[in-house]
Amino acid sequence: AGSDNPYVPCAPSPCVNGGTCRQTGDFTFECSCLPGFEGSTCERNIDDCPNHRCQNGGVCVDGVNTYNCRCPPQWTGQFCTEDVDECLLQPNACQNGGTCTNRNGGYGCVCVNGWSGDDCSENIDDCAFASCTPGSTCIDRVASFSCMCPEGKAGLLCHLDDACISNPCHKGALCDTNPLNGHYICTCPQGYKGADCTEDVDECAMTNSNPCEHAGKCVNTDGAFHCECLKGYAGPRCEMDINECHSDPCQNDATCLDKIGGFTCLCMPGFKGVHCEIEINEGNSGLNDIFEAQKIEWHENLYFQGHHHHHHHH
């Protein structure tokens, strides 16, 4: 080296990573390294992992004069010593209504009836322990099973002879088999009763009210009944008031008033009669008018009183 550019070992410092340079001779130096580094120029990071203390399955990751731990999912903290509360972290850790219990390094599920597995996601196969009669098909359900019976068999386990095979239910009744004893149960159609649905229901003798309205007469029939209605009523239960005005019985522009079982015609001046069909003689018109008006008023009073209305005379 020329005298113009003399070599100074520590200028610039060859020590890296914060190492301090000390000149030991004209052309020599020594680096004093910071903790965690080694080598003639402190170039090497000392591997701290051989002496690591990562717990619970944590993996050591070297740092500068220290180390860090990469934790498995169930653990946290610098050294993986802190338990992760999976029940808090994953609200659905346990499925199908299972109860979650946090544990060191994991969690546990207490499953409700019918479910199993670590997270209660497996439906227990109840058919594995079922005793469906041979020939029937077992269907697994949650915490239970059901047996699908072949023709002629019935009951919870298909162990009973199906009493419906002999068609014991009459009148188109629906037949079911009691799953406990194998007896038939008939669901009778309207109008019939009894174990086999052979007995007629007397609708007219029922203790509650007459099924026929407006004082209609009830007549029992096989499996049903019918109503004989009073004059002025119609319908299966005499529920309809017949509108006698419907056929326009009033003549000469008269107004028709419908009544129970009949009608009244309000005649135009100069006419009279049930249907206002009679033309009045003009000579007696004044007297006839008064007579007709009174007759009409009498009819109106009857009509309104029959319907519980009050009629005021003005």
């Epitope: 203390r53 220290t66 010593t81």
Partner: antibody, heavy 120, light 107 residues
């Protein structure tokens, strides 16, 4: 209940060998770091060796004072930890404890200890 | 290796006294410190881990504190069964190292 029971201690001449055993129960052996710690009469506690758990490949660490002379090992099928001690010296005389590293950077379960006496 | 300096080496105290033991480490151990109690002829028993966490079944009169390089064990009200030797231990890295111990004696 966590239990650790040491055995195999006794009197041995300098240069001799001895194998200590530690039978464990009450926990999953392979899940834990296991340690050997010794205590000379009237003295403090001195860590000797450790074997990490299965998750850490059962890697092993020794104190400088026993390196190349002692060997730590385990038999998971028997749930037993061992310490093979060779080239024994008088200063190895101590009560040897087997302990479990409980995943807390601390030794949470200890055996009753077994006495090793190295003397001529 | 991490050096552990425990003090005092012994302390004389009476039942009901408050006792404090300190432990200093040669480098930051990130709260990876444990305290043990040992009675003559018996194995050590873990009292405190993680510098301040009480081990299951240990009476609440025992407490730990500290971080970095300075740690303390406190017995708030000394009981007759507490007369023993106490050790600190760093669990940050191997080799594990223990303090020299503190003997708590009856005054």
């Amino acid at each position: 209940e966590v239990q650790l029971v040491e055995s195999g201690g006794g009197l041995v001449q300098p240069g001799g060998s001895l194998k200590l055993s530690c039978a464990v129960s009450g926990f999953t052996f392979s899940d834990f770091y296991m340690e050997w710690v010794r205590q000379a009469s009237g003295k403090g506690l001195e860590w000797v060796a450790a074997q990490r758990n299965k998750a850490n490949d059962f890697s092993i660490v020794y104190s400088a004072s026993v390196k190349d002379r002692f060997t730590i090992s385990r038999d998971d099928s028997k749930s037993t930890l061992y310490l093979q001690m060779n080239s024994l010296k008088t200063e190895d005389t101590a009560v040897y404890y087997c302990s479990r590293d409980g995943g807390k950077l601390a030794l949470d379960a200890w055996g009753q200890g077994t006495l090793v006496t190295v003397s001529s | 290796d991490i050096q552990m300096t425990q003090s005092p080496s012994s302390v004389s105290a009476s039942v009901g006294d408050r006792v404090t033991i300190t432990c200093q480490t040669s480098e930051d151990i990130y709260s990876g410190l444990a305290w043990y109690q040992q009675k003559p002829g018996k194995s050590p028993k873990l009292l405190i881990y993680g510098a301040s966490r009480l081990q299951d079944g240990v009476p609440s009169r025992f407490s730990g504190s500290g971080s970095g390089t300075d740690y303390t064990l406190t017995i708030s009200s000394l009981q007759p069964e507490d007369f023993a030797t106490y050790y600190c231990q760093q669990g940050f890295k191997y080799p594990l190292t223990f303090g020299g111990g503190t003997k708590v004696e009856i005054k």
